[in-house]
């Protein structure tokens, strides 16, 4: 038979009562039922109480009084009365409803929303609902958009309802604002702020925050966290689709993140416990926003115990060149859970031997690899939760590209100088891994460009390889190779012996192993000048006499050589260049410059220098010579001649020494005659001796000499007396 | 880019009349209430003026211009103007035009026009 | 005369927290929310904070606002040099039917 609707003591559909009253609320009915009440009063424990007992004829009927102590504002709603356990097409004739106002002077609005606005989300053409209802159905309230606008109820598009608030049948982008619901009671006014938001569809991002694809060991806990990120007026429904669906398995959790000032995160975590085999497949979370979706998703495997297995990557010696930035040592890892990784250097553990050392996963990174990195790495993997430990060991080389030891120590800007005709020995000391090879090549010097460095104009020449039989350039002695410990370390000299001097070139030392090549460059230059630059002087001139200087310089070294004046004006030295310069003259292994100025006064006195700029380093050097020119002078004797005698077939000298600018030339006269040079009668140095050998009768008579320069003349005469008689009819 | 461009400032004698206008570019100028603020020299901003988005029910004034001071707006030409008449002394500053928030305050302001009101 | 308090000065130095306050009343702070504007001299004043204590797009989270009762206050964080300017508390008024502003802080970095 058909129950009867549950009877509510108020009657009719509304009821108003003042706050601070006691609600007094019973139902009768004819099965037993149950009370809906706002969501402020079913929070109550203290105000709120309901008693059930049989009542009506023979108590027959069920009765239950719904007390509400001290009733508030808040507790303004629908209190509905209806019977349990109803099948659902008979619902709506089970139940009795009434809506009770609970009046407060000094709170118009049910909710008031003052200093944080309620978000409310519109949908445009839907209809949206401003829920500022009201403690009693005889307060006005005003809509007004913030703050100039007020949205008048017309009973068709804005319809004003007590229990609802402001009913918007089909919102338009023009209200979306600020929108505040005004009542003045008493002359004050009240207000309650809603902010509405256009609802949107967009789905901006959908993640699952766990590692892909996800590993567990039977029996433990599968956490799956999906989180979509949307606009700030935007909502999502999430759900799950996973293996075991069928069995309801999962529980999910779902949260909202509104703190974001720009998004909207929306959280779904689902949570299986106890996994078994059954549960291992693929897991989706999907995201939809009215007509928009995205998924995500990821495998889940199961385990049935910890493992570790772990092979070499590619060889079990492995290579790598010092030098490099980076080197990976890895290997080849499978295992479940994560193991602990340890690597170990040599024994050591690896990170705490350099900081150079780190950790990826299951890789060992090695910065800036040195030659020190060479060695035996292990890797130790352990799951200590379930005694699961393998380690697995790795040797790596760390090879070296040559490095030769004289290129790095030599500190000359420019090359040596080697004299012509000696024996010299060169030598190359290479070190790397593995162990270099070194060759000798000879590249010879062009002698068409003087005024070029010999090693740059070599690139169209030839190199000649070199061993101890070559014939191409300078004589080799020998060319041996020797081990020698330099600085700790093993390392290859090379010498080349040169026989003899005599080319010019540049000997290439090369050193090459599967890393690379390196080479040195030995300019071997010939000298025939001590140095390499030389100043010559033929003789200090006197006034009128020509100066006649030399200046010759390597030619492999030096170009633009060039005669100077150098003088002192007001303290500085100021060089004058000389006009009366030749051309230079270019010989096998030098340049010749020649400077000669005729007829020199005492003006050409000064300091001369021959300047010469070295092709290697590009600085100028000088050599310098101090001239004096010597005023002229005429002759004057030291001593005069003096009459002497001397014994006949002994010999005799006579001196006339004579001293003048220029030096004077002697004559020698017998009784006004010039003496010639002739057996028997010899002029010493410049004249100025005259030495007469076994004397005869014929040697006596009166001496004379005179010294002649452009300045004069002065003379000195002298008898000779011969003593003792003749031999000449004895030898006849 | 949203902008108000303001115009009409100048100098004029005590007594006289000023009809400033502003410009809108680069929003819906007919779903936005507009405002008119100023700021005396080297002094703080004062509210003037204030218009719904129709133009048609709500202009609130401040009391000293209310008589004095019109504001309108013409949604067709996306400008905001102010009529003011009888100008005193203290009617000098910089006027500037704002538009009111979806949600509350001014959020864009316009460079400002200079009004000068002195004998 | 402003109709809502502020004090006319307030310095810190590079790094400093700054506070500055404004008071009103029922019928402005009170029942109505609070906008805070900075004015850098020379140029347009430009929204700050609005609602109280929100932030619009591009204004750094070093300003922040709050309201109790019928006062309300800004907060800069780690002060830079290019904050100092002068700053506005705004209200609409239910008395006055308009808007009301603060009479201004002039902002001072040492």
């Known amino acids: 038979s058909k129950l009867k609707d549950p009877e509510l003591s108020l009657k009719g559909t509304q009821h108003i009562m003042q706050a601070g009253q006691t609600l007094h609320l019973q139902c009768r009915g004819e099965a037993a039922h149950k009370w809906s009440l706002p969501e402020m009063v079913s929070k109550e424990s203290e105000r709120l109480s309901i008693t059930k007992s049989a009542c009506g004829r023979n108590g027959k009927q069920f009765c239950s009084t719904l007390t509400l102590n001290t009733a508030q504002a808040n507790h303004t709603g629908f209190y509905s009365c209806k019977y349990l356990a109803v099948p659902t097409s008979k619902k709506k004739e089970t139940e009795s409803a009434i809506y009770i106002f609970i009046s407060d002077t000094g709170r118009p609005f049910v909710e008031m929303y003052s200093e944080i606005p309620e978000i409310i989300h519109m949908t445009e053409g839907r209809e949206l609902v401003i829920p500022c209802r009201v403690t009693s159905p005889n307060i006005t309230v005003t809509l007004k958009k913030f703050p100039l606008d007020t949205l008048i109820p017309d009973g068709k598009r804005i319809i004003w309802d007590s229990r609802k608030g402001f009913i918007i049948s089909n919102a338009t982008y023009k209200e979306i604002g600020l929108l505040t619901c005004e009542a003045t009671v008493n002359g004050h006014l009240y207000k309650t702020n809603y902010l509405t938001h256009r609802q949107t569809n967009t789905i901006i991002d959908v993640q699952i925050s766990t590692p892909r694809p996800v590993k567990l060991l039977r029996g433990h806990t599968l956490v799956l966290n999906c989180t979509a990120t949307t606009p700030l007026n935007t909502r999502v429904q999430m759900t799950w689709s996973y293996p075991d669906e069928k069995n309801k398995r999962a529980s999910v959790r779902r949260r909202i993140d509104q703190s974001n000032s720009h998004a909207n995160i929306f959280y779904s975590v689902l949570t299986i416990d106890k996994m078994q085999n059954k549960d291992k497949g693929l897991y989706t979370c999907r995201v939809r926003s009215g007509p928009s979706f995205k998924s995500v998703n990821t495998s889940v495997h199961i385990y049935d115990k910890a493992f570790i297995t772990v092979k070499h990557r590619k060889q079990q010696v492995l290579e790598t060149v010092a030098g490099k930035r980076s080197y990976r040592l890895s290997m080849k890892v499978k295992a479940f859970p994560s193991p602990e990784v340890v690597w170990l250097k040599d024994g050591l553990p690896a990170t705490e031997k350099s900081a150079r050392y780190l950790t990826r996963g299951y890789s060992l990174i090695i910065k800036d690899v040195t030659e020190e990195d060479a060695g035996n790495y292990t890797i130790l993997l352990s799951i200590k939760q379930s005694n699961v430990f393998k380690n697995l060991t790795a040797t790596l080389i760390v090879n070296v590209k040559p490095q030769i030891y004289e290129k790095a120590v030599s500190s000359f800007p420019d090359p040596a100088l080697y004299p012509l005709g000696s024996r010299q020995i060169l030598t190359c000391t290479a070190y790397g891994i593995p162990q270099p090879t070194i060759k000798w090549f000879w590249h010879p010097c062009n002698h068409n460009h003087s005024e070029a460095r010999c090693d740059f104009c070599s690139n169209n020449e030839e190199s000649f390889i070199l061993d101890a039989d070559s014939n191409m350039g300078n004589r080799i002695e020998s060319i041996t190779q020797r081990m020698a410990i330099i600085e700790g370390k093993n390392k290859m000299a090379s010498t080349l012996v040169v026989a003899d001097s005599r080319i010019s070139g540049i000997y290439i030392c090369i050193a090459s192993n599967k890393v690379g090549t390196v080479g040195r460059n030995i300019s071997f230059y010939i000298t025939d000048v001590p140095n390499g630059f030389h100043v010559n002087l033929e003789k200090m001139p006197t006034e009128g006499e020509d100066l006649k200087l030399s200046c010759t310089v390597n030619k492999f070294l030096y170009r633009d050589v060039t005669w100077i004046l150098l003088r002192t004006v007001n303290n500085r030295t100021m060089h004058y260049s000389i006009s009366k310069q030749k051309m230079a003259i270019t010989k096998e292994h030098s340049i010749t410059l020649n400077l000669t100025i005729m007829n020199v006064s005492l003006q050409d006195s000064g300091t001369y220098a021959c300047r010469a700029r070295n092709v290697y380093t590009g600085e100028e050097i000088l050599q310098k010579k101090e001239i004096t020119i010597r005023d002229q002078e005429a002759p004057y004797l030291l001593r005069n001649l003096s009459d002497h005698t001397v014994a006949i077939s002994s010999s005799t000298t006579l001196d006339c020494h004579a001293n003048g600018v220029p030096e004077p030339q002697i004559t020698w006269f017998k009784n006004n005659h010039k003496i010639q040079q002739e057996p028997g009668i010899i002029l010493g140095p410049g004249s100025s001796t005259l030495f007469i050998e076994r004397v005869t009768e014929e040697d006596e008579g009166v001496y004379h000499c005179k010294a002649t320069n452009q300045k004069g003349s002065v003379e000195s005469s002298a008898y000779l007396t011969v003593q003792g008689t003749s031999d000449k009819s004895n030898l006849e | 880019e949203v902008q108000l461009l303001e115009s009409g400032g100048g100098s004029v004698q005590p007594g006289g009349s000023l009809r400033l206008s502003c410009t809108a570019s680069?929003?819906?100028?007919?779903?936005?209430?507009m405002n008119w603020v100023r700021q005396a020299p080297g002094k703080g901003l004062d509210w003037v003026s204030s218009i719904n988005r129709q133009g048609d029910i709500s202009t609130y004034h401040v009391d000293s211009v209310k008589g004095r001071f019109t504001i309108s707006r013409d949604n067709s030409k996306n400008t905001l103007y102010l009529q003011m008449n009888s100008l005193r002394a203290e009617d000098t500053a910089i006027y500037y035009c704002?538009?009111?928030?979806?949600?509350?305050?001014?959020?864009?302001w316009g460079q400002g026009t200079t009004v000068t009101v002195s004998s | 005369q402003s109709v809502l308090t502020q004090p006319p000065s307030a310095s810190g130095t590079p790094g400093q927290r700054v506070t500055i306050s404004c008071s009103g009343s029922?019928?402005?702070?009170?029942?109505?929310?609070v906008n805070w504007y900075q004015q850098i001299p020379g140029t347009a004043p430009k929204l700050l904070i609005y609602l109280n204590s929100q932030r619009p797009s591009g204004v750094p989270d070093r300003f922040s606002g709050s309201k109790s009762g019928t006062s309300a206050s800004l907060a800069i964080s780690g002060l830079q040099s290019d904050d100092e300017a002068d700053y506005y508390c705004?209200?609409?008024?239910?008395?006055?039917?308009?808007?009301?502003f603060g009479g201004g802080t002039k902002l001072t970095v040492l």
């Open positions: 704002t538009k009111n928030h979806d949600y509350h305050g001014m959020d864009v």
């Open positions: 029922r019928s402005n702070i009170g029942n109505n929310f």
């Open positions: 680069g929003f819906n100028f007919e779903d936005y209430g």
């Open positions: 705004a209200s609409w008024d239910d008395s006055l039917n308009g808007w009301v």
